[in-house]
C-alpha cells in the first residue's frame, strides 16, 4: 500500500466496570477495541470502513494501561494500510467490547457487549508526529494517539509519489524525502539514466555509456575524443577533420607518401638514366637505349615487348627477334590469320564474322564470355557488386548476392527492420527504437519481449498516463487510474486541452 | 514507423452530417486508445472525443449527442460520425494515438484533415 493509519492505545478506564446498557461486567470488563476508518463523513453513518478496520484481543480488565508491542497479537500501534491518495480527511470509530469467550480471538465469541464508543471527524496531514486525544463519556475514559506515515517507497502529502531507489539499466537514483529523484554520482536526465561522460569529453565527437568514460565516434580518437584520425595509409601528413590527409613539407600525393625530392634523397636509377621527381611512385626513371624496368636496371630483351600475337612465342636473336606463329596464323608477328569463318573459329557459342572479303574473321562473343575466340569466362564477381559482407556467387548468366543475417536486396544494401523478424510475444506491438526493437505489450504481459504473463499488481506494468496514479481494484489483473486535472480517459490517455509543451510526434 | 492518416473532411453546410477515418498503420492499434482532436484558427488543440484501449468513450460537452466515435479493429482505422454540424465546429481535425513504450509517453498525430461548416 502506499501509507499506514497508526493508531496507539494509551489507556482506558472503566472504574465501575460497566457496560454502555447499564449492566455491570461479571466478574470485570474484559475488554477489546474494535477500530473503523472510513472517508470523512459529517455525520457518521453504519456501513462498510472504506479505508479499513482491525479487531485487538482481550487488552485488559475495567481498566488498564496499553504498553507497546511490535510484533504478534496485541500489536500497538495498530496498523491499518491503505493503497490509495490519502485525502487529508478520515473518519474514525473506536468502540470498546466486553466478552466472555476467547481472550485472543474475542471477535469470534458468543454474548459480545458493547462498553462504549467514540467517534472522531477531521482532517490529518501525513507526518510523523502524533496527534494526542482523550474521550470521556459518563463511565469510561479512551486516551490514544494517531498519526499518517506513508510506507516503503512512497512519499509527498498524500503518499502518492513511488519512488524506489535503483540502480540498473532504466535508471541509477535515490529518493529525496519529497519523493522526487537524487541522481547517483555520475548520472544524469529526468529518470538519471544518462551518463555523465568523462570531463572535457567533446560533445559531438564522443559519447559513453557509462559514467567517466568517453568512446569516440568514427573519425575521433584520443583520451577526449578531440584528435581526428587522418586518412588510412597517410604517411607524412596530419588532419583537421576526420580523414584528412594534409601533405608535410616535402610530401606529396594522396597519401602524402611521394618524397617531392626522391631523385636527390635516393638516386634511384640505375645504368646512366634521368631521374625526374614526378609520376606515381614519385620519380622517374628515363632509360638509355638497350635498358628497361623501373630502375632502368634490366638489360633489354628484344622480345620485352611481346611483339608476337595470336599466341605466337619469341625467340631473341642477336639484334632482333624472332616470332614462332601457331597454327592457323602468319607473318612477322603472326598478325595474320589463315583460318576463316568456315574453320569455326569462335568458341562458347561465338558468332562468326568475315573480314577483308573472307580473308579473316571476327567473333562477336555471347554473355559471359570474352577473346578473340570468345575463349575467356567473365567473372562477374570481380567488380565486389555485393555491401555489408554479402557473398557474391556466380549463377549462369548473372550473379546473385547471398546476405549476412539483417541485410536483403539485389546487393545486400538494404537493412532489415528489427521489427521485420516478429519479436513480441502475446501479442505485443514492435517499435523500431534507435537502440533496438521495444515491444508494447497488452493488458496482463511485460517484459522486454512481452514474455512475462502478470499475475500480481495489474499496476505494476504502469498502464496509466500524464502521471495519473494508478490503484489496483478488486481483482488482481483490474486497475484504476486517477487521472490529474485536465485529463480524461480510463488511462488518463486524453489530455482536454493541448499546451504548446505537449509531446507531439507527428 | 506509425502513421496515422485522416480522410473525409470537406465543405457542409449547417446541420449536415461528415464522416471522418482515421487510419493506422506501421502498428496493430487494437491495443491502444485512438482519439480525435480539433484546432480553430488561434485557438488551441481541444479534444472532441477519445476511445479507450478498454473501449470505454469520452465526449467533450460540445460533442455530446451529435458525434460519434467507433473503431474497426480488423482494419487499423478509428471514425468519428459528425451529424448536425454548427458553424463552431469549423476546424482542422486531427487523429491522435497514444502509446507507452519502455515507460516512455508518445503521442502520434496524423497531419489533420479541415472540415468547414458553412451557414
Known amino acids: 500500500g502506499s501509507g499506514i493509519f497508526q493508531l496507539r492505545l494509551q489507556e482506558f478506564v472503566n472504574q465501575r466496570g460497566m457496560l454502555a446498557n447499564g449492566q455491570s461486567c461479571e466478574p470485570g470488563c474484559r475488554t477489546f477495541f474494535r477500530i473503523c476508518l472510513k472517508h470523512f463523513q459529517a455525520t457518521f453513518s453504519e456501513g462498510p470502513c472504506t479505508f479499513g478496520n482491525v479487531s485487538t484481543p482481550v487488552l485488559g480488565t475495567n481498566s488498564f494501561v496499553v504498553r507497546d508491542k511490535n510484533s504478534g497479537s496485541g500489536r500497538n500501534p495498530l496498523q491499518l494500510p491503505f493503497n490509495f491518495t490519502w485525502p487529508g480527511t478520515f473518519s474514525l470509530n473506536i468502540q470498546a467490547w466486553h466478552t466472555p469467550g476467547d481472550d485472543l480471538r474475542p471477535e469470534t465469541s458468543p454474548g459480545n457487549s458493547l462498553i462504549s464508543q467514540i467517534i472522531i471527524q477531521g482532517s490529518l496531514a501525513v507526518g510523523k508526529i502524533w496527534r494526542t486525544d482523550e474521550q470521556n463519556d459518563t463511565l469510561t475514559r479512551l486516551s490514544y494517539s494517531y498519526r499518517v506515515i506513508c510506507s516503503d517507497n512512497y512519499y509527498g502529502e498524500s503518499c502518492s509519489r513511488l519512488c524506489k531507489k535503483r540502480d540498473d539499466h532504466f535508471g541509477h537514483y535515490e529518493c529525496q524525502p519529497d519523493g522526487s529523484l537524487s541522481c547517483l554520482p555520475g548520472w544524469t536526465g529526468k529518470y538519471c539514466d544518462q551518463p555523465i561522460c568523462l570531463s572535457g569529453c567533446h560533445e559531438q565527437n564522443g559519447y559513453c555509456s557509462k559514467p567517466d568514460e568517453c568512446i569516440c565516434r568514427p573519425g575521433w580518437q584520443g583520451r577526449l575524443c578531440n584528435e581526428c584520425i587522418p586518412h588510412n595509409g597517410c604517411r607524412h601528413g596530419t588532419c583537421s577533420i576526420p580523414w584528412q590527409c594534409a601533405c608535410d613539407e616535402g610530401w606529396g600525393g594522396l597519401f602524402c607518401d611521394q618524397d617531392l625530392n626522391y631523385c636527390t634523397h635516393h638516386s634511384p636509377c640505375k645504368n646512366g638514366s634521368t631521374c625526374s621527381n614526378s609520376g606515381p611512385k614519385g620519380y622517374t626513371c628515363t632509360c638509355l637505349p638497350g635498358y628497361t624496368g623501373e630502375h632502368c636496371e634490366l638489360g633489354l630483351s628484344k622480345c620485352a615487348s611481346n611483339p608476337c600475337r595470336n599466341g605466337g612465342s619469341c625467340k631473341d636473336q642477336e639484334n632482333s627477334y624472332h616470332c614462332l606463329c601457331p597454327p592457323g596464323y602468319y607473318g612477322q608477328h603472326c598478325e595474320h590469320s589463315t583460318l576463316t569463318c568456315a574453320d569455326s573459329p569462335c568458341f562458347n557459342g561465338g558468332s562468326c564474322r568475315e573480314r577483308n572479303q573472307g580473308s579473316s574473321y571476327a567473333c562477336e562473343c555471347p554473355p559471359n564470355f570474352t577473346g578473340s575466340n570468345c575463349e575467356k569466362k567473365v567473372d562477374r564477381c570481380t567488380s565486389n557488386p555485393c555491401a555489408n559482407g554479402g557473398q557474391c556467387q556466380n549463377r549462369g548468366p548473372s550473379r546473385t548476392c547471398r546476405c549476412r543475417p539483417g541485410f536483403t536486396g539485389t546487393h545486400c544494401e538494404l537493412h532489415i527492420s528489427d521489427c521485420a523478424r516478429s519479436p513480441c510475444a502475446h501479442g505485443g506491438t514492435c517499435h523500431d527504437l534507435e537502440n533496438g526493437p521495444v515491444c508494447t505489450c497488452p493488458a496482463g504481459f511485460s517484459g522486454r519481449r512481452c514474455e512475462v504473463r502478470i499475475t500480481h499488481d495489474a499496476c505494476a506494468s504502469g498502464p496509466c498516463f500524464n502521471g495519473a496514479t494508478c490503484y489496483t481494484g478488486l481483482s488482481p489483473n483490474n486497475f484504476v487510474c486517477n487521472c490529474p486535472y485536465g485529463f480524461v480517459g480510463s488511462r488518463c490517455e486524453f489530455p482536454v486541452g493541448l499546451p504548446p509543451s505537449f509531446p507531439w510526434v507527428a | 514507423e506509425v502513421q496515422l492518416v485522416e480522410s473525409g473532411g470537406g465543405l457542409v453546410q449547417a446541420g449536415g452530417s461528415l464522416r471522418l477515418s482515421c487510419a493506422a498503420s506501421?502498428?496493430?492499434?487494437?491495443?491502444?486508445?485512438m482519439g480525435w482532436y480539433r484546432q480553430a484558427p488561434g485557438k488551441q488543440r481541444e479534444l472532441v472525443v477519445g476511445?479507450?484501449?478498454?473501449?470505454?468513450?469520452h465526449y467533450a460537452d460540445s460533442a455530446k449527442g451529435r458525434f460519434t466515435i467507433s473503431r474497426d479493429d480488423a482494419k487499423n482505422t478509428v471514425y468519428l460520425q459528425m451529424n448536425s454540424l454548427k458553424t463552431e465546429d469549423t476546424a482542422v481535425y486531427y487523429c491522435?494515438?497514444?502509446?507507452?513504450?519502455?515507460?516512455?509517453?508518445?503521442?502520434?498525430w496524423g497531419q489533420g484533415t479541415q472540415v468547414t461548416v458553412s451557414s
Open positions: 491522435y494515438v497514444p502509446v507507452k513504450v519502455a515507460g516512455l509517453e508518445y503521442a502520434y
Open positions: 506501421g502498428s496493430t492499434f487494437s491495443n491502444y486508445a
Open positions: 476511445i479507450s484501449s478498454d473501449g470505454s468513450t
